[in-house]
Interface confidence: low
C-alpha cells in the first residue's frame, strides 16, 4: 500500500492507535503541528477511549462481533478528528500478549479475529495502516520510546536553535504491566552479553541506544494470577474449596476450572482429572505474610542458579541502571495502595501489608473506584510486583526509589501505542535533524 505524500497547509495532523490488549482495547488519538513533524515532544494525546467489553483475544469463537464492540469509541474518534482530515489520518491497531497467546493456541482463530478487524477498518473513513500482532520485544521498545519521548530525553533545543542530543541526559527505563505479559526495557551499562536476542540497537535522531528489552509472556497481571490460583489448587488437599491468602478476609469467589486452566499459561498445571466445568471456590484469608510467600512460587528464581545477570525463569538480564518509569498495571496497583511517583521499598512493603490485612468490607472505603475484579486482586498484584522487581529484576532498598510509578506525562498516557505511532509514521527519524531552525525575533 503506497501512501502519497500530501502537502498540507500549516495546521494539525492526527494519528490513531488502537492498543488491543488482553483484557481491553484502548483507542488513542494523537495530534501534532504539521510544520513540526520531526521535532521532538510535539506529539500529544488528545483523546483516549476504552472499548467496552474484554480484549479482542476473547472473540476467538465469535470474531464477527469485534466490530460492534469498537463502534462506540470509533464514533467518538470521528468527532475528535476534523472530517476533512479523516482520509489522511493514519490508524493502526497493534495487538499484544492476549493475541500472541491466542495465535499460539489457535492460529486460525487469531487470524479470523484480525481479518474481522481489518474488514471493519477498511470501511472506516481513516487511512487504515493495518492490524497486527506486535512482538513482546516491540511492545517493550515502543513503551521505552514513549516514556523517553514524553520526558524529552531524546533531543533538546540548544542556544543555536538546533535540536541536539542532550549531553549527560539519562534515558529512563520502562516497566510495563499488561494483562498477559510484562516488559522491562532499559539502556544497560557496559557489561552486556551482546549475543542475546534481548539486546537491540535503536537508532533515534542519529544517536544509537543499546537497549535491553524482555517481555515475559504469562506474567501479565491476569495470567500471573491464574498461575497463582493454579498453584494454590495444585498444593491443596481439597480440590473444590480452598483458601487464598491474597484475597481479602470475608471474600469468597467461585470459578470454573476452565477459568483457571483454559489458558496456555496454566495448561501444564492442569490436574489429572481436569474437567473445565468443575467449580472451585476460593476463600480469602487476607494473610499478608502467607500471600507474600506463596506468590514467590509463580516465578522460577532457582533457574538463575544465583547468577547476577539473570532475572527469573533462566532469562538473561544485565544489571539494572538508571531511573525507571513503571506504568500501566504497575501504576494502577501502586495507586490502589495510595502510592504514586517514587517512594521507598519500605513504604511499598508496609502499604502492601496494610492493604492485604484489610477485610473485604473495608476495601470500598479504601479504593476511590471500586471494582470487584480489581479490588480482590490488588494484594496479589502488590506481592507479585515485589517479587518481580526485587527478586527478579534485582531492585534493592537503594535502587527502588529510582522507580517512578506514573500513569502519564502531561496529558499523554505512558503506553507503547505512542512509540508505535511515532515509529510507523517515521516521526522519530534514525538520522539526526541538523537543520537549523529559524531564529525567532527577540
Amino acid at each position: 500500500q503506497i501512501h502519497k505524500q500530501e502537502v498540507l497547509p500549516p495546521g494539525l495532523k492526527y494519528g490513531i492507535v488502537l492498543d488491543a490488549g488482553s483484557s481491553r482495547t484502548t483507542v488513542y488519538v494523537y495530534q501534532w503541528p504539521a510544520e513540526k513533524e520531526n521535532n521532538t515532544g510535539v506529539v500529544s494525546q488528545t483523546f483516549k477511549c476504552s472499548v467496552k467489553g474484554s480484549g479482542i483475544s476473547s472473540y476467538g469463537n465469535n470474531p464477527q462481533d469485534v466490530p460492534r464492540a469498537f463502534e462506540e469509541c470509533m464514533q467518538k474518534v470521528k468527532g475528535q478528528v476534523p472530517s476533512h482530515l479523516h482520509g489522511s489520518t493514519p490508524i493502526h491497531l497493534g495487538a499484544t500478549a492476549g493475541m500472541r497467546l491466542l495465535r499460539l493456541q489457535n492460529e486460525t482463530a487469531a487470524n479470523e479475529v484480525l481479518e474481522s478487524i481489518q474488514s471493519y477498518f477498511k470501511s472506516q473513513p481513516f487511512d487504515f495502516r493495518g492490524a497486527q500482532i506486535i512482538s513482546g520485544q516491540e511492545e517493550g521498545v515502543y513503551g521505552w520510546i514513549t516514556a523517553n519521548y514524553l520526558m524529552g530525553n531524546f533531543l533538546e533545543k540548544n542556544l543555536w536553535h538546533m535540536w541536539v542530543h542532550p549531553h549527560g541526559v539519562e534515558t529512563t527505563g520502562a516497566l510495563d504491566l499488561g494483562g498477559a505479559s510484562t516488559q522491562i526495557s532499559f539502556v544497560a551499562g557496559e557489561k552486556m552479553d551482546l549475543n542475546t536476542s534481548d539486546i537491540m540497537q535503536v537508532s533515534l535522531y542519529g544517536y544509537v541506544y543499546t537497549l535491553y528489552t524482555h517481555s515475559f509472556q504469562c506474567y501479565g497481571r491476569n495470567e500471573a494470577e491464574k498461575k497463582f490460583l493454579a498453584m494454590l489448587l495444585q498444593n491443596s488437599p481439597t480440590k473444590n474449596h480452598l483458601t487464598n491468602p491474597c484475597y481479602p478476609r470475608d471474600y469468597s469467589i467461585s470459578f470454573t476450572m476452565g477459568h483457571v486452566f483454559d489458558s496456555l499459561c496454566t495448561v501444564d498445571q492442569r490436574p489429572e482429572s481436569y474437567n473445565p466445568n468443575d467449580v472451585i471456590t476460593f476463600e480469602g484469608t487476607g494473610d499478608p505474610s502467607l500471600c507474600k510467600e506463596k506468590v514467590a512460587s509463580i516465578f522460577d528464581f532457582k533457574a538463575c542458579h544465583d547468577q547476577e545477570t539473570c532475572s527469573f525463569d533462566g532469562v538473561y538480564q544485565p544489571k539494572i541502571k538508571g531511573p525507571f518509569v513503571a506504568f500501566a498495571g504497575f501504576y494502577y496497583t501502586a495507586s490502589a495502595l495510595n502510592l504514586s511517583g517514587s517512594f521507598s521499598l519500605d513504604t511499598f512493603n508496609s502499604s502492601t501489608w496494610n492493604f492485604c490485612s484489610q477485610n473485604w468490607s473495608q476495601l470500598p472505603l479504601l479504593l476511590p473506584k471500586f471494582d470487584e475484579v480489581y479490588a480482590r486482586s490488588y494484594c496479589f498484584s502488590a506481592n507479585y510486583i515485589y517479587h518481580l522487581f526485587v527478586n527478579g529484576y534485582k531492585f534493592t532498598e537503594e535502587t527502588w526509589p529510582q522507580i517512578h510509578f506514573e500513569k502519564e506525562v502531561g496529558n499523554s498516557s505512558i503506553a507503547w501505542s505512542l512509540g508505535y505511532m511515532l515509529s510507523l509514521t517515521n516521526q522519530i527519524p534514525a538520522e539526526s535533524p541538523l537543520i537549523r531552525l529559524p531564529i525567532e525575533p527577540p
Epitope: S236, P237, T243, T285, S289, E293, K294, L345, N349
Partner: antibody, heavy 118, light 110 residues
Framework: QVQLVQSGAEVKKPGESLKISCKGS????????IGWVRQMPGKGLEWMGI????????RYSPSFQGQVTISADKSISTAYLQWSSLKASNTAMYYC???????????WGQGTMVTVSS | QSALTQPPSASGSPGQSVTISCTGT?????????VSWYQQHPGKAPKLILY???KRPSGVPDRFSGSKSGNTASLTISGLQAEDEADYYC??????????FGGGTKLTVL
C-alpha cells in the same frame, strides 16, 4: 546442600545482651522466611517469630514481642536473634528454621544452647 | 495464643499402628489446611515429617500419614519401628499470621 548453621553455645549472666546467628546456604536466602523456635529444658517447641530476609519484614509471636529482636543481613545470608537484657528464664535451646509454605519448617539449624545464670 | 493440645504420651508395639491427635480451634487447625508434624529425637533438632495436613517431604517413609477433621488433626504411624521412638509435635498456621505448636507427645515403642 541446603543448610542452616547456627552460632555456638553461650553462657551469660542476667542483664547481659546477646545476639545469636543462623547462616543459610545452598538456596536463595532472600526468598524464604526464617523462623526462630525456643525449646526450654525438658519442654516443647515454641514459635518466637519469623523474618523475610529479602526485606527484613518480621512477625513475632505475641509472647515474644518486645522481648527479642529478629534481624537479618541478606548480604551474608544470616539471620539473628538478640536480647538486650537476658533473664534466667531465657535459658533454652534456640533453633532457626526455614519456613517452606505456611508454618512448615523444612530445614532446621543444629540449635544454639543459651544458658543464663548468675 | 494457646498451644495446641496433644496427648503427653503414646505407645505401640513394633509393626502396630499408632495415632497422635492435635486439637486446636477454628482460628488455627480448623481454619487452615496448614498443619505440620515434626519428629524430634533426644538431643537432635526437629525434623519435618508432614506438612499441609497430608503431604510428606521427600525421604519421609509413607508409614507416616496425616488427616484432619474439624479442629483436630491426626498423625498416624503404621508399621511402627524402633527408630520411630521420639517426641512428636504438631504445628498450625493461625489467623493472626503466626504459628502455634502443640505441647508434644512422647512416643514409646514397646
Amino acid at each position: 546442600q541446603v543448610q542452616l548453621v547456627q552460632s555456638g553455645a553461650e553462657v551469660k549472666k542476667p542483664g547481659e545482651s546477646l545476639k545469636i546467628s543462623c547462616k543459610g546456604s545452598g538456596y536463595s536466602f532472600t526468598s524464604y522466611w526464617i523462623g526462630w523456635v525456643r525449646q526450654m529444658p525438658g519442654k516443647g517447641l515454641e514459635w518466637m517469630g519469623i523474618i523475610y530476609p529479602g526485606d527484613s519484614g518480621t512477625r513475632y509471636s505475641p509472647s515474644f514481642q518486645g522481648q527479642v529482636t529478629i534481624s537479618a543481613d541478606k548480604s551474608i545470608s544470616t539471620a539473628y536473634l538478640q536480647w538486650s537484657s537476658l533473664k534466667a528464664s531465657n535459658t533454652a535451646m534456640y533453633y532457626c528454621a526455614r519456613q517452606q509454605g505456611a508454618g512448615a519448617f523444612d530445614i532446621w539449624g543444629q540449635g544454639t544452647m543459651v544458658t543464663v545464670s548468675s | 495464643q494457646s498451644a495446641l493440645t496433644q496427648p503427653p504420651s503414646a505407645s505401640g508395639s513394633p509393626g502396630q499402628s499408632v495415632t497422635i491427635s492435635c486439637t486446636g480451634t477454628s482460628r488455627d487447625v480448623g481454619g487452615y489446611n496448614y498443619v505440620s508434624w515434626y519428629q524430634q529425637h533426644p538431643g537432635k533438632a526437629p525434623k519435618l515429617i508432614l506438612y499441609e495436613v497430608t503431604k510428606r517431604p521427600s525421604g519421609v517413609p509413607d508409614r507416616f500419614s496425616g488427616s484432619k477433621s474439624g479442629n483436630t488433626a491426626s498423625l498416624t504411624i503404621s508399621g511402627l519401628q524402633a527408630e520411630d521412638e521420639a517426641d512428636y509435635y504438631c504445628s498450625s498456621y493461625t489467623s493472626s499470621s503466626t504459628v502455634v505448636f502443640g505441647g508434644g507427645t512422647k512416643l514409646t515403642v514397646l
